[in-house]
Structure formats: C-alpha cells, structure tokens
C-alpha cells in the first residue's frame, strides 16, 4: 500500500515508455551475475561493502539494469478480472541470475455486500479496478532490490500482485447479470502463476508467496493451492512457502459489540461469514474438510487454518495489530484509554501469543502497528535481538537439510520469535509512535502514560517497585 499514492491525479511525472531490452549482437556473450546467496556467513558488513562496490562499478555500464521499478503486466487471460471486469495483473522485476521468486499479495480490507462494495468502488477504485493502475511501481521493503533495504532476498525475482478483488484473495466468481461485481482473488493468483511460468518461474527453486493484511490472510488461503497447481503442471521441484504478514486475525469478541454495517465496524466473524457467501469464497481443501458445510469461514482465521497447511508458512504478526483492534472497536484516539480498553488490549496480546505457540516460524513483536514487510523500516524491528530479515534467513537455512523445515533452529539462528513483554510498545525497537493529536514522537513511557497506564497498579501486578518499572520503560527494556 505504501508507494501507491501517486496513481491517478498526480501529474508530476508521465510514466516511462515501455522498455524493450536490446538483444545482444550475434556472437556477443551475455553477461550474467548469478549472485544468489542463500546464506551470508561471516562478516555481514564486509559482504555489504563488497556488494556495494560491485554495484557501483557495474552501474556506469548498466544503469537501467539497476532500475528499482517493477513493471505492470495485465493478464493475457482477460476473463480473470478485478471486481469491475477490468483485467487483473501483476508488477514484475526479473532477476535473471536468481532462482528465487517472491510473489507479494497486496492488502486493503474487503467489502462483503452490495452497499459497501458500491461505496468502496466510488472511493477506493484502485482496489476494485485496474483501469488507472500506474505502469510501474517501486519495490520497497522485502520487494526492494537494494541489499541495504532488503538484506534477505534482494536478488530475487520480485512480483507485486495488486489487490483488486476485495475478497481476501478467496473468490472464484465472475461478473454476470446476477453479480454486479466479480470476486476472483483465488483465480487471479492461479493465473498470475500460470503466466509467470512462461517468464522464468518454471526454473525456480523457491516460490515465496507473501502478503500483508488481507494479502497475509490470502497467503494462508492460497499457499497450498499454488503448490498443488505447480505439481499438477509438472513443476514438483519448486518449493512453495508462505510469508503471512499482519493477516493472522482472531475471531474474538469485540470490545464493544456493533452492528455489521460497515467493513471496519463489523466483527471479524460476521464480516467473513457474509463475505464468503457474497464472494463464493474458496478455502484450503484440508481445512474445509475439518469444518461442516456453512462453517468454512473458520478457515480465514490463521490459528484454525495453519495446522491444516502442508506448505511451510512464516507468520509475521504485531501482537497489538491495529486492524484487529479496529474490527474489535478499540479506538485509541480518546485520551486516556479507559481501564476496560487497556485490559482488553493486554488480553489481545496474550491471546495472540497463545495462538502462535505452535507456529514453527514466527516473528511477533509487542507493538501497536499494522503491516511490516514492504515498509522500508522492516529491517529495524527486533524480537529477542533478532531482526525479521535475519529470522527469515534462519528459516531459509532450516530447509537446506530437508524439504520440511527442521523443528530445531540452528544455534544462534532462531526463527520462532514471539515477544513476551505484556504491553504495546514494550519492545524498544517498535516503529516510532506519534501522539495522534499533536503528531509528536513519543517514547514508550510517554505512550503508556498517554494510554492511561497506571504505573502503581501495573508495578503491583508485576511485583516490583513503581520507580523500577518507570526506569525500565524509559530505558525501553
């Protein structure tokens, strides 16, 4: 969603003309640098310095090869569409020396009835139509080709799949006389994979299906289907894995019950129950078998679908996810937060931590935020001293011995990382918080006070002196 803000009205820069790559003259060797490092051991700084100097020395001869942009390709099969019947598509930046492919599913909530889909169409059309998509996009975070911004997979083939189906990537119904909108999220993924096979994916070693928010849930719903699709098409050697960011929601009780009128006020279960019918939503087959007919909505919730998945999935989830709090009707704009809200928030963190207990590969910082993997600061957050790119690298390494992730991470290379401190932003590496009213940056202590945090009570709960607790908060421990 970042980097998507300049798409219709802005007149700063016309899109560049489509690039055609000049073919080398007959008999000329084609240079390629297959720098596909699976793991970088030893001195990371020295490695980065070498990469930088190599990049700089290559830059004059091939400036356009270092272009950060992913280029738009609308699907050739125009029957696979966005909500309004316009063709779906994907943005691609190839990396010819690499056998890794990263397919990223965009997020952006959903709509679940005619009224809120109409309203979405009139205010957020880019999430329902490809008619005004820009020709290029810049890859950020895990989609960046800069080693500094993406130490994890900077050299991979990058694919960004825009979300234009409003169905949490689950739908399989086309636009018709009866249906004003098409909901084809699941089919869009299948078609993108099919088209990419002709663009080099056929030679892939690893396909990482990633996504944020609704895209993160989309990963959980589609990763096994993609693996099955590739097997059926004759590519069983491609290892399919998932990376679900901010898509692991709880079907919990709302803080304040509200009628299911609008997307953001509707309880998670209500919204998905309605949506799955409206979209003709599909869920993973093994999960579907666990629930009786009409109960398929359960499979949209990570902790219920995860145990049924065959593909390895890495789960990234803020313990205090803003989208979860929004659907739970916890709005942190009043000041201070009431005690009931504060307890509800703490309990949410506890519940979420509980659901991640048996997730082999996870990264769950105790922060109040939403989405991370395509943010440029995604390298900055740490859990127990390990950053997300590092944890992903450790997860990757665990596959080298066996096809299935080994249960025990290597010493000093963990990938099950869940914060255990109990409050939002008790982790000092959390993204900066700003006072919602003044816009000023706040430290952890200020933030917690702002939220109505009672030092006396909490110190008592934790069995420590209030002064010691305040000191800990100020130091960010």
């Amino acid at each position: 969603s970042e980097g998507r803000k300049t798409w219709r009205r802005r007149g700063q820069q016309p899109p560049p003309p489509p690039r055609t790559e000049a073919a080398p003259a007959a008999g000329q060797p084609v240079e390629s640098f297959p720098l596909d490092f699976t793991a970088v051991e030893g001195n990371m700084d020295s490695f980065m310095a070498q990469v930088k100097s190599l990049a700089q020395s290559l830059y004059p001869c091939s400036a356009q090869q270092l272009n950060e942009d992913l280029r738009l390709h609308l699907l050739l099969n125009t029957s696979v569409t966005c909500n309004d019947g316009s063709p779906a598509g994907y943005y691609l930046k190839e990396s010819r020396g690499s056998r890794r492919w990263l397919l990223f599913l965009e997020g952006g909530w959903y709509c679940f009835n005619r009224e809120n889909c109409d309203s979405r169409y009139d205010t957020m059309r880019r999430l329902m139509s490809s008619r005004d998509w820009p020709r290029t996009r810049t890859g950020t975070g895990i989609l960046s080709s800069q080693p500094e911004e993406n130490p994890y997979w900077w050299n991979a083939n990058m694919v960004f799949i825009p979300y234009c189906s409003s169905d949490v990537w689950s739908g399989a119904s086309s636009k018709s006389e009866k249906n004003e909108y098409a909901f084809m999220g699941a089919l869009i993924i299948q078609e993108v994979v099919r088209e990419l096979l002709g663009r080099g994916l056929s030679g892939a070693k690893v396909l990482l299906l990633a996504g944020s928010s609704a895209g993160g849930t989309g990963v959980l719903l589609n990763v096994d289907r993609v693996a099955e699709q590739l097997e059926k098409l004759g590519y069983p050697a491609i290892q399919v894995r998932g990376l679900a960011d901010s898509g692991w929601f709880l079907d919990n009780k709302q803080y304040r019950r509200s009628d299911c009128i609008d997307t953001i006020n509707c309880a998670p279960t209500d919204a998905i129950r309605r949506g799955i019918r409206y979209w003709s939503g599909m869920v993973p087959e093994r999960c579907q078998r666990q629930f009786k007919e009409g109960e398929e909505w359960n499979c949209f919730f990570g902790y219920k679908v995860y145990p049924t998945l065959r593909c390895p999935v890495f789960v990234v989830q803020w313990l205090f996810d803003e989208a979860q709090l929004t659907v739970d009707n916890v709005h942190l704009t009043g000041q201070p937060v009431q005690e009931g809200q504060w307890l509800y928030i703490q309990n949410l963190g506890r519940e979420l931590r509980g659901t991640l207990k048996d997730v082999q590969a996870s990264f769950a910082p105790a922060c109040l935020s939403h989405e991370i993997i395509i943010r440029s600061y995604w390298t900055d957050v740490q859990v127990k001293g390990t950053s997300l790119p590092r944890a992903l690298h450790c997860w990757d390494r665990s596959f080298h011995d066996s096809h299935k992730a080994s249960k025990t991470p290597m010493k000093g290379c963990p990938f099950h990382l869940v914060d255990s401190c109990p409050w939002p932003h008790c982790n000092p590496s959390c993204p900066t918080i700003r006072d919602q009213f003044t816009g000023q940056e706040m430290n952890v202590a200020q933030f917690l006070m702002h939220m109505g945090f009672d030092v006396q009570t909490v110190a008592q709960q934790q069995g420590m002196e209030p002064s010691k607790l305040l000191g800990m908060l100020s130091n960010g421990n």
């Epitope: 969603s1 909530w109 309203s119 169409y121 009139d122 205010t123 953001i264 803003e322 709005h331």
Partner: antibody
Framework: DVQLLESGGGLVQPGGSRKLSCAAS????????MHWVRQAPEKGLEWVAY????????YYADTVKGRLTLSRDNSKNTLFLEMTSLRSEDTAMYYC????????????WGQGTSLTVSS | DIVLTQSPASLAVSLGQRATISCRAS??????????IHWYQQKPGQPPKLLIY???DLESGVPARFSGSGSGAAFTLNIHPVEEEDAATYYC?????????FGSGTKLEIK
C-alpha cells in the same frame, strides 16, 4: 469543463415537499459517486446523502433518513433529491458534489440551490 | 459515526505569518497507506473549494503555501505565508466510511 448545476430550491411550507435536481456535464457521470451537502445560514457544512455511481446504493445522514429520497438518471446525467415532510431546520443551501474515486474527496461542487422552509 | 473536531473555531493571523488548523477524528481514518481526510476553503457566497486531499496531496491549481499533514486521527492544515486572499472558512472532511462527516469549520481572519 466539469460542471454541476443545481435547481429546484425556493420557498416551501413546513410539511411540504420539494425535488432538487443536479445536472452534470463535462465528465462521465456514471463513473462517479455523487453526494448532496447542505449548509444552513451562517452554519457549517453538513453531509446529507450519497448515491453510488451505478445508482444501486444510496445512503443518508440520520438527520434526514426517511424524509429524503435520492435517485439518479445516468442516461440524462442528472442527480435528484426528493424531500418530504420538510421542517424549518431543512432551510439551507443545497450543494451537489462529485466524489473522486481515488479517495472520496469532493473535487467538484455546484453553485448550490437555496431552500427555505417557512410558513 | 466518525466525529471530526476542528480547532480553533476562529483565528486571526498577520500577513506573511503561519496559520495552523487542527482536525481530530474520533477514530482512525487511515487505512492501507492512505488517510481519508480532505480540506476545503469556503468564501462567503461561494461553494467550498478543494485544497488538500488524502491528508497531504495538494489539489492542482492550489498555491504551494497550503500544506496538509497527519495520519491516524490527527491532521493539520498549514498556510504559510498567509496572504490577504486566504481569509475564508476552512473545513476538514473524512471519506473513510459512510456516513461522511465534516468538521465544524475554522474562520481565518487576516490581521
């Protein structure tokens, strides 16, 4: 040139009815959600109602629910607002506004039509 | 419904100085990287005119002395340097969900 032109205002007795129109030109009318916004004398702006681009969904502010009917004729590029059981507090300048579909902001407004409800 | 609280109700600013208007939402109006807050200027006898959309984007034809910032539930409109012709009432508006609402307005007077 994008233009919106409201008409139909005037003096109406309390309990009476009135139909306001908004004629659009210079853009593909059926591509845009349309809204009515009103402004009582010396007061601020109040959002009143929304019609989706296809005309299939309408939504009203609580203050007018049950007394207003919004409709549109995309073939004639016209938006209508039918008002019944009018009260003195409905006295206002009524503006028709086009909502941009990349954010829902009102990027084009009509000049407004003035409605006075008084005996 | 989302309530927008605008402040101050009125302000007087000297020519060439900075005018700052605040708009607070009762809950977050930001989602998927966008903030659904917009700013309008209205002069007596005229319809409102769009200045800033999606919290910080300047509408074409609007002078660069107008700027918007903020995210979540807190937003600001800045005018610097203020000019004579900026005397008007300014409104914030959200389009995050239906029903849309407006702030109560801020009347700017030039000293």
């Amino acid at each position: 040139d994008v233009q919106l032109l409201e008409s139909g205002g005037g003096l109406v007795q309390p309990g009476g009815s009135r139909k306001l129109s908004c004629a659009a030109s210079g853009f593909t009318f059926s591509d845009f959600g349309m809204h009515w916004v009103r402004q009582a004398p010396e007061k601020g702006l109040e959002w009143v109602a929304y019609s989706s681009s296809g005309g299939t969904t309408v939504y009203y502010a609580d203050t007018v629910k049950g007394r207003l009917t919004l409709s549109r004729d995309n073939s004639k590029n016209t938006l209508f607002l039918e008002m019944t059981s009018l009260r003195s507090e409905d006295t206002a300048m009524y503006y028709c506004a086009r909502a941009s579909y990349d954010g829902g902001y009102f990027d084009c407004w009509g000049q407004g039509t003035s409605l006075t409800v008084s005996s | 419904d989302i309530v927008l609280t605008q402040s101050p109700a009125s302000l007087a600013v000297s020519l060439g100085q900075r005018a700052t208007i605040s708009c607070r939402a009762s809950k977050s109006v930001s989602t998927s990287g966008y903030s659904y807050i917009h700013w309008y200027q209205q002069k007596p006898g005229q319809p409102p005119k769009l200045l800033i959309y999606l919290a910080s984007d300047l509408e074409s034809g609007v002078p660069a002395r107008f700027s918007g910032s903020g995210s979540g539930a807190a937003f600001t409109l800045n005018i610097h340097p203020v000019e004579e012709e900026d005397a008007a009432t300014y409104y914030c508006h959200h389009s995050r969900e239906l029903p849309f609402t407006f702030g109560s307005g801020t009347k700017l007077e030039i000293k």
